[in-house]
Interface confidence: low
């Protein structure tokens, strides 16, 4: 049996994945639990097995189809349930009517690369992954650069208020190792949140030329 409060949070990646986390205060004894997605206007439904991510929370990904297929639209509503098996029955532990385009979290940007690097600046580009064509250009980005001797949390955030898949980092120190990350967010959706940060891209600025004033 399960007692205590329950929190059930899901996000849609805008294409073919709904990721869910279920948190439950109280003991859950060796019970098989799943998330079940039941769209209001689609013929398919989908399930995923909740796997523990901490002592009181479980997560899973509902794979709705091929990664770049558009499985849901702005008018869809998907009933999402946490179901746990009790003997031969499934007990509903949590339920929500999920509006996918109000609860967006895109995949982290990919394919980060250094386009051009100099002593004091570096031009970096990236690509968005599995993002719906519905957004057109209505995306924004945040970027951060890790400098030597600092942490990611200390890095100032650079905001790009448009769909711009490149950045030119200025005022860098010559011959210095840096790391760079970027994340993306659609402008649409009341509960939409930032994507995870991209994998860090390591780069090194060029050394200053000898005998020249830098």
């Amino acid at each position: 049996a399960v007692n205590g409060t329950s929190q059930f949070t899901c996000f849609y990646n805008s294409r073919a994945n709904i990721s869910c986390v279920w948190s439950q205060d109280g003991a859950l004894q060796d019970t098989s639990c799943q998330v079940h997605a039941w769209p209001d206007r689609r013929r398919w439904n989908q399930t995923c097995e909740l796997l523990p991510v901490s002592q009181a929370s479980w997560a899973c990904n509902l794979i709705l189809g091929a990664p770049d297929s558009q499985k849901l639209t702005t008018v869809d509503i998907v009933t999402l349930r946490v179901l746990c098996r009790e003997g031969v029955r499934w007990r509903v532990m949590a339920i929500q009517d999920f509006k996918p385009f109000e609860n967006l979290r895109l995949m982290a940007p990919i394919s980060l690369q250094v386009v051009h690097v100099e002593t004091h600046r570096c031009n970096i580009s990236w690509e968005i992954s599995q993002a719906s064509h519905y957004f057109e250009r209505h995306l924004e980005f945040e970027a951060r650069t890790l400098s030597p001797g600092h942490t990611w949390e200390e890095a100032p955030l650079l905001t790009l208020k448009q769909k711009q898949e490149w950045i030119c980092l200025e005022t860098l120190t010559p011959d210095t190792q840096y790391e760079f990350q970027v994340r993306v967010k659609p402008l649409q959706g009341e509960f939409t949140t930032w994507s995870p940060w991209s994998q860090p891209l390591a780069f090194r600025t060029k050394p200053a030329a000898l005998g020249k004033d830098t």
Epitope: H36, N45, T47, L83, V88, R89, W90, V92, I95
Partner: nanobody, 123 residues
Framework: EVQLVESGGGLVQAGGSLRLSCVVS????????MAWFRQAPGKEREFVAA????????EYVDSVKGRFTVSRDNAKNTVYLQMNNLKPEDTAVYYC????????????????WGQGTQVTVSS
């Protein structure tokens, strides 16, 4: 093995109402998620509505939302389908279905079925 017996069908004019009942015997009723399906002449059997074992959660096909209400009385081993504002396109044989697996209830496979009751809506 579980047995299902439907009743309450009949002939009704468009805009009228009917209440279908399905009595379940042969097993513990609360083990089952219950559903109603329908099959019009020359068409495939289609999902209409479902109610979970507890009765707290219901599902409907879009075409009947706001007009049909599915419910159950676990003390009487009975599931109901209240059909209001009936339309000629609601004409079909209505079947009661039971499944212990919540996930499978919308599917026509692996359900236990009743024999069906005819609903005819005249214009």
């Amino acid at each position: 093995e579980v047995q299902l017996v439907e009743s309450g069908g009949g002939l009704v004019q468009a805009g009228g109402s009917l209440r279908l009942s399905c009595v379940v015997s042969g097993d513990v009723f609360v083990r089952y998620t219950m559903a109603w399906f329908r099959q019009a002449p020359g068409k495939e059997r289609e999902f209409v509505a479902a109610v979970t074992d507890s009765g707290r959660t219901t599902e409907y096909v879009d075409s009947v939302k706001g007009r049909f209400t599915v419910s159950r009385d676990n003390a009487k081993n009975t599931v109901y389908l209240q059909m209001n504002n009936l339309k000629p396109e609601d004409t079909a044989v209505y079947y009661c279905a039971a499944n212990t697996d919540y996930f499978q209830i919308r599917s026509v496979d692996n359900n236990a079925w009743g024999q069906g009751t005819q609903v005819t809506v005249s214009s």
